[in-house]
């Protein structure tokens, strides 16, 4: 843990047992800000979360400390190390002087917290626009105007071919200067990200001559998800869903190539289904068979009534707020016509259960049901449209006999989860149950999928 971050562990000698953060409250960090203000948002930078917490539950509450003496609870939050947590605070409407961050994760590390005021806060009346200073190594000559006022472009004319230059940007606010930005290294005469030429040796995957994310070629000249880039300068196109199944998208694009089954495996789609909550608007039978390729997984959807129920089952008989208050559990059972030894369970989503006012990710609990009606738990899995379909590998305990799975049970707690298909992935031409039943003098025949007699030839 870094000196620059806070963690419940940070006050503890590394050779001692770290303190527990006991439920229900856990440990908390209290931070006070220099100026009390009416907030518009709160941003928190987290640098470490234990894997046990899976981003949800690590921060089990954040309280705003109001000047009036009130503590305003924002509830549990999902935190990630690669993205700061930003919470909009539209309705607070009163001055806040500090925050308390509660955690059940004794390893959680918090780097910084920022309270942003609403517009036209009196504190900002004296503010001047930010200025930027460019710093170079080797240093720029004294007469070069390296402080940028309203324009943000700096041109360096004093360069020698083959020389290595490093540049940093410093932000100036009044008389205060920021820490320098991360350095950019440039060898004069050689390529750089943004020159339209792909320098593979520098890790570039594309170069479209700009520094914009979201156009297929990122700020750092990396190809973005669902895009394919060709030529120099790069021309990028969004390939997912264009109707053409290209070789590179066979494994990733359901819309263009259908569901991908790796070699050596067989995917069996549900032949029957039963569900916990259904009516004419959300019948359970729609999850039978392969999912419709046209369905895109959507996130933060609060009205699932629009065209989803023809392709996917969701529990339409209960509203989201009600289900949360009543702590309702929803489930579906997908049955398969050929019981098999499962290698994986595949769950196709049309919505991932996220709610527009919330950062919480929904989880599903998955069980396999074998031909003897025994249940085999495959654990809890986080739902995300970014990871769709969800492929849950089945790990077999080799000290136990193999079993044939005939059904999958999926349970969850949000009626905003819509599932369009469930598949049982098994081994093609290979059945461990039959294999393990072969007697002495028999061998398993993949072609016949049974035990056959064999005789050793001398």
């Amino acid at each position: 843990s870094s000196v620059r971050t806070w963690s419940p562990n940070s006050a503890v000698n590394p050779h001692t047992v770290p303190p527990a953060c006991p439920e229900p409250q856990g440990c908390y960090l209290e931070l006070e800000f220099l100026y009390p203000l009416v907030p518009e948002s709160l941003t928190i930078w987290v640098t470490f979360v234990s894997t046990d917490w899976d981003s949800s539950g690590a921060v089990n509450d954040i309280k705003l400390l109001a000047v009036s003496g009130k503590n305003i609870s924002l509830g549990p939050q999902n935190v990630f190390c690669d993205v700061p947590l930003t919470i909009r605070l539209w309705d607070v409407g009163e001055e806040v002087y500090g925050i308390q961050i509660y955690t059940l994760d004794e390893h959680l590390e918090i780097d910084a917290a920022m309270l942003t005021s609403t517009a036209d806060t009196p504190l900002c009346l004296q503010c001047k626009p930010l200025k930027y200073k460019v710093v170079r190594d080797p240093p720029l000559q004294m007469d070069v105007a390296s402080i940028l006022h309203l324009n943000r472009k700096f041109v360096d004319m004093d360069l020698n071919l083959g020389s290595v230059y490093q540049y940093w940007v410093i932000t100036i606010s009044g008389t205060e200067e920021s820490e320098p930005s991360p350095a950019v290294t440039y060898i004069h005469g050689s390529g750089y990200c943004g020159d339209g030429i792909i320098q593979k040796d520098q890790g570039e995957q594309c170069d479209d001559m700009n520094k914009i994310n979201g156009d297929g070629c990122s700020l750092f000249c990396r190809q973005e998800v669902s895009f394919n880039c060709i030529d120099e300068p790069s021309r990028c196109y969004f390939h997912d869903g264009d109707g053409v199944c290209e070789e590179f998208e066979q494994k990733t694009s359901i819309k263009d190539c259908g569901v991908y089954t790796p070699q050596g495996f067989l995917d069996q789609w549900a032949s029957n289904a039963s569900v916990s909550h259904q009516d004419q608007q959300c019948p359970g039978w729609v999850i039978i068979g392969q999912p419709a390729a046209s369905q895109v997984c959507r996130t933060k959807v609060i009205d699932l009534s629009e065209g989803i129920s023809q392709h996917a089952w969701y529990p339409c008989t209960i509203s989201y707020p009600y289900s949360q208050l009543a702590q309702t559990t929803f489930w579906l059972r997908a049955y398969f016509s050929q019981p098999m030894v499962a290698a994986a369970v595949i769950v196709h989503l049309v919505t991932d259960g996220t709610y527009y006012g919330d950062q919480k990710q929904e989880t599903i609990s998955v069980q396999l049901l074998d031909t003897k009606d025994q249940s085999h738990d495959l654990g809890l899995h986080v739902l995300s449209c970014r990871n769709n379909p969800l492929i849950i590998p089945v790990v077999h305990d080799l000290s136990q006999p193999f079993y044939h799975s005939q059904a999958v049970r999926v349970s969850f707690s949000s009626p905003l989860v819509a599932i369009s298909g469930v598949a049982l992935r098994s081994f093609d031409n290979f059945d461990p149950v039959t294999l393990s039943s072969c007697q002495r003098g028999e061998t398993y025949s993949p072609a016949e999928q049974s035990c056959v007699h064999f005789a050793c030839e001398k």
Epitope: Q281, I302, D303, L304, S305, E306, C316, I318, S319, Y320, P321, Y322, L325, A326, Q327, Y355, Y356, G357
Partner: antibody, heavy 123, light 107 residues
């Protein structure tokens, strides 16, 4: 029959708190949700929050968060709503209303209402 | 917050008339809409829940329809006891919000 009976009218000074009670009868109190709704003179109805009367879990409108506290006493089949830091604009009729069954909901909406409690905030 | 807009804000009608009140949500709320009737000085009364389900004990002249963003409450044949203010309310997302009300007056 199913009914909700609320406490009497209150007059409060700005900055004070008010606690309104709502006694349920004719049904299993802990098997249903309980809403709190208010209506300022001549205004639309405004939802304040609700409670799972079985577990005590609550959710309130962000507009009131930090000012409203919803609690219950299961032995008395009574729900309470406390509003703190009162201001003149909190002058309204406050209603409790039964929400759906928490076990097997067959209806939604707020199907049984209390008679209302008038709270006047005035200096 | 989801805004609920009712129209008209008031309607004058006679006994026996068919009256239609509409309610529009600022974003989709699936079927999670309820209709209430309120008379002066009284608590509201639930008429319709889940957009179209008639609450037990409510006369069949009241009916509701709609899904997503557009909803309708219809009184097929107005009776003297139906003169009141009607509110719609969404319960699909927090905070639950009510429409501004439609006052049904005697012509």
């Amino acid at each position: 029959q199913v009914q909700l009976v609320q406490s009497g009218a209150e007059v409060k000074k700005p900055g004070a708190s008010v606690k309104v009670s709502c006694k349920a009868s004719g049904y299993t109190f802990t098997s249903y949700a309980m809403h709190w709704v208010r209506q300022a003179p001549g205004q639309r109805l405004e939802w304040m929050g609700w409670m799972n009367a079985g577990t005590g879990a609550t959710k309130s409108s962000q507009k009131f968060q930090g000012r409203v506290t919803i609690t219950r006493d299961t032995s008395a089949s009574t729900a309470y709503m406390e509003l703190s830091s009162l201001r003149s604009e909190d002058t309204a009729v406050y209603y409790c209303a039964r929400g759906p069954s928490l076990e097997t909901p067959t209806t939604f909406g707020m199907d049984v209402w209390g008679q209302g409690t008038t709270v006047t905030v005035s200096s | 917050d989801i805004q609920m807009t009712q129209s008209p804000s008031s309607v004058s009608a006679s006994v026996g008339d068919r009256v239609t009140i509409t309610c529009r949500a600022s974003q989709g709320i699936s079927r999670w809409l309820a209709w209430y009737q309120q008379k002066p000085g009284k608590a509201p009364k639930l008429l319709i829940y889940a957009a179209s389900s008639l609450q037990s004990g409510v006369p069949s002249r009241f009916s509701g329809s709609g899904s997503g963003t557009d909803f309708t409450l219809t009184i097929s044949s107005l009776q003297p006891e139906d003169f009141a203010t009607y509110y719609c309310q969404q319960e699909n997302a927090y905070p639950f919000t009510f429409g501004g009300g439609t006052k049904v007056e005697i012509k």
